[in-house]
């Protein structure tokens, strides 16, 4: 999956950021999990949407809104529930 961060500049502890995790052309619909740098699940303020394209493959976008600490790592894990395959990506904000 790919990750984007907004705002992506001039961030200070206390800022609320929006982290978007995107994965494209999967089948079937994926499961998305978020966790912090210590592996603790992040379940609040998460919005996940999935959309099928003409081929019946799914694009997934999951958005996490989080208040930054002094520094932090945020990871997104996209799981194929049938194949039990995981793909993950993370962003570290210092």
């Amino acid at each position: 999956p790919s990750m984007t961060l907004e705002p992506n500049k001039d961030l200070r502890p206390g800022d609320t950021v929006t982290i978007t995790c995107s994965s494209y052309q999967g089948y079937p619909e994926a499961e998305v999990f978020w966790q912090d740098g210590q592996g603790v699940p992040l379940t609040g303020n998460v919005t996940t949407s999935q959309m099928a394209n003409e081929q019946g493959l799914f694009d997934v976008h999951s958005i996490l809104r989080v208040v930054l600490g002094a520094n932090g790592t945020y990871s997104c894990l996209v799981r194929n529930p049938v194949l039990q395959q995981d793909a993950h990506s993370s962003v570290t904000i210092t």
Epitope: E6, P7, K9, P13, T16
Partner: antibody, heavy 122, light 107 residues
């Protein structure tokens, strides 16, 4: 060129609200923070808060929490600062400023509006 | 909150003199300090960012230094247009704060 143009002077009664606008041009409005800073007569600069118009992320100084609201209209590239429950001590010049990336990973208030004088008087 | 203390509040000097303005932070702010110049009836103008970097178009007679808690702005040879109020400000942590300013006046 980058420009921040603010709305005109206001005279307000104690207890009322004021909304100051700041129209940006010459850069991508959604890609930089907008700050609000005020200056009481003969006094120094006081930071009030900031907004990132791209995703409407805001942060307010504790002193103004609950009384100030900073918003942005992406369609007109305009930021707003509304201050409520006005008192005489809020008489000041209110400035908006861009938090620009003046060099890679270096940020500062590089462009300022001309200031808006708000007078609170009964 | 981090308190930025500027000294002295006022300085009376003559054109051509060298001047050093001081700004002290109540706690470590790294190099997240900027300096601004303000003339009567005008908005502040950015001079120095990152404690020691001169902003575009600012004359070489202005220089900044420091890190941690102690910062200085030096004007090597005062010009008539330099008489103004100078503010330091930190954006290391919320709430961002400014010093009380140092007024440079002509002796």
């Amino acid at each position: 060129q980058v420009q921040l143009v603010q709305s005109g002077a206001e005279v307000k009664k104690p207890g009322s609200s004021v909304k100051v606008s700041c129209k940006a041009s010459g850069y991508i409005f959604t890609a930089d923070w907008i700050y609000w800073v005020r200056q009481a007569p003969g006094q120094g600069l006081e930071w009030m808060g900031r907004i990132y118009p791209g995703v409407d992320t805001t942060y307010y100084a504790q002193k103004f929490q609950g009384r100030v609201t900073i918003t942005a209209d992406k369609s007109t590239s305009t930021a707003y600062m509304e201050l409520s429950s006005l008192r005489s001590e809020d008489t000041a010049v209110y400035y908006c400023a861009r938090g620009g990336e003046v060099r890679r990973d270096f940020y500062a208030l590089d462009y300022w509006g001309q200031g808006t004088t708000v007078t609170v008087s009964s | 909150e981090i308190v930025m203390t500027q000294s002295p509040p006022t300085l009376s000097l003559s054109p051509g003199e060298r001047v050093t303005l001081s700004c002290r932070a109540s706690e470590n702010v790294g190099t997240y300090v900027s300096w601004y110049q303000q003339k009567p009836g005008q908005a502040p103008r950015l001079l120095i960012y990152g404690a020691s970097n001169r902003y575009t178009g600012i004359p070489a007679r202005f220089s900044g230094s420091g890190s941690g808690t102690d910062f200085t702005l030096t004007i090597s040879s005062l010009q008539p247009e330099d008489f103004a109020v100078y503010y330091c400000g930190q954006r290391y942590s919320y709430p961002f704060t400014f010093g009380g300013g140092t007024k440079l006046e002509i002796k």
